[in-house]
Every structure is written in C-alpha cells, then in structure tokens.
Amino acid sequence: MNGRVDYLVTEEEINLTRGPSGLGFNIVGGTDQQYVSNDSGIYVSRIKENGAAALDGRLQEGDKILSVNGQDLKNLLHQDAVDLFRNAGYAVSLRVQHRLQVQNGPIGHRGEGDPSG
C-alpha cells in the first residue's frame, strides 16, 4: 500500500557573502523560462562545491528564491533575475522557500525526500 506524498514548505532568511565567483549557486526559472509548470519563480538548480552557498550549508538545490536584499523575484524575466544577483553587492540576503517531500505512509511514517519537486 503506497502512502500519500505531501510537501512541507518552510521559509528561511539566508545571508551570504559573495565569493570570487559569486554566491555559489545557479538559477533557473523566470517568466520566459518556467522551471515549474505554471510558476515563473526563480529556483536553485545547482549548488557549487566550495562556493559561498555550499559553505553556508542552508541553501539547497530545488529551493525557490523569493527575494534578494528585500527585492521580490516575482514576475521577472530570467535575465533580469540574473542581473539582480550579479548586482546584489558583497553581503546578500536571500529569502528562500524550502519544499521538503514528506511521505505519509499507512502507519504515519514520515521521511524526507528530494526537495527539488
């Protein structure tokens, strides 16, 4: 008997310091390049080894980035979102949404799965 798959959504503020090759993650998404169906949000596609995000440890592949330094990322073209990150300065505050897959088994077993949805 298969359990139902649910998602636990949490938000977190992450402060990163820019390294020699940026903040240490790649993004996908935007109004012109939807990564998730019917969602033009900006998502983390890759965390770079030894980059700022990896060293901090909180940002995960599949996370949705809601804002950069308080600036909302809703309804942005992909390149406009990229430019926000490029020009965000040395100390960068990210508001991110983690989406954890939770398996509700027949006896209530809960296990975390792939957050990338």
Partner: nanobody
Framework: DVQLVESGGGLVQPGGSLRLSCAAS????????IGWFRQAPGKEREGVSC???????YYADSVKGRFTISRDNVKNTLYLQMNSLKPEDTALYYC????????????????????WGQGTQVTVSE
Amino acid sequence: DVQLVESGGGLVQPGGSLRLSCAASGFTLDDYAIGWFRQAPGKEREGVSCISSHGSTYYADSVKGRFTISRDNVKNTLYLQMNSLKPEDTALYYCAASYYSDYEVAVCRSDALDAWGQGTQVTVSE
C-alpha cells in the same frame, strides 16, 4: 582566480574542420553554464553554442548540424568541434561563463556574463 584560456584557432579552407578548446582554472567547469561566442570585424558579438551545468545545449541556427559543444570534466575544458566551416564563420571566438544563469539559451543571448577568455582567431579562407 577564475581564468578561461582558448586555443585551437587558425586558418582553414572552406569545408574544413577545427576544434577549439577552452581551459578553465580557478573553478569547476561543470558547475557553470558556459558557452562559445564569436565576433567578426564590424559585427556584433553572437552566442554560438552554450551548455548548462546539467548538460542541456543550445546552438545558433547558423551553426546547427555543423558545430558540437562538449565538456571534459576531468580536464576541466570546454570544446567546440567545428565542421563544414564557411567563410562567414571567420571571427574571434571566445568562451564565457555565467556565475548565476543555468539556462543555456539565456547565457548564449546574454551581454552580461561574468568570466571571459581572451579569444582565439578562426579564419576560413581559400
């Protein structure tokens, strides 16, 4: 320090082939969306071919079926195999990477990339 160094350009006859290389140092190539760009004298720079960190590829219409982009993660090197070369392929060829975008089409169409090589000249002529 992040560095990209191109090589492999030269003079070739129409119909000939070349393989360009772009050696990366200071970062791991497969963590980045990266691509090949070219600029001919008096013309705007154009994206030729780009590849995302996950391996998705984009080719400009003018090179589809003739050029192939690839990456050797062990050698930390990007390649561009150029076949059936035409005089209009004559240009200075650069590789460039984006620190943020992982969308190969956007990278190839971008004016705002973060790391550039110095370029290697390709001349296609009799």
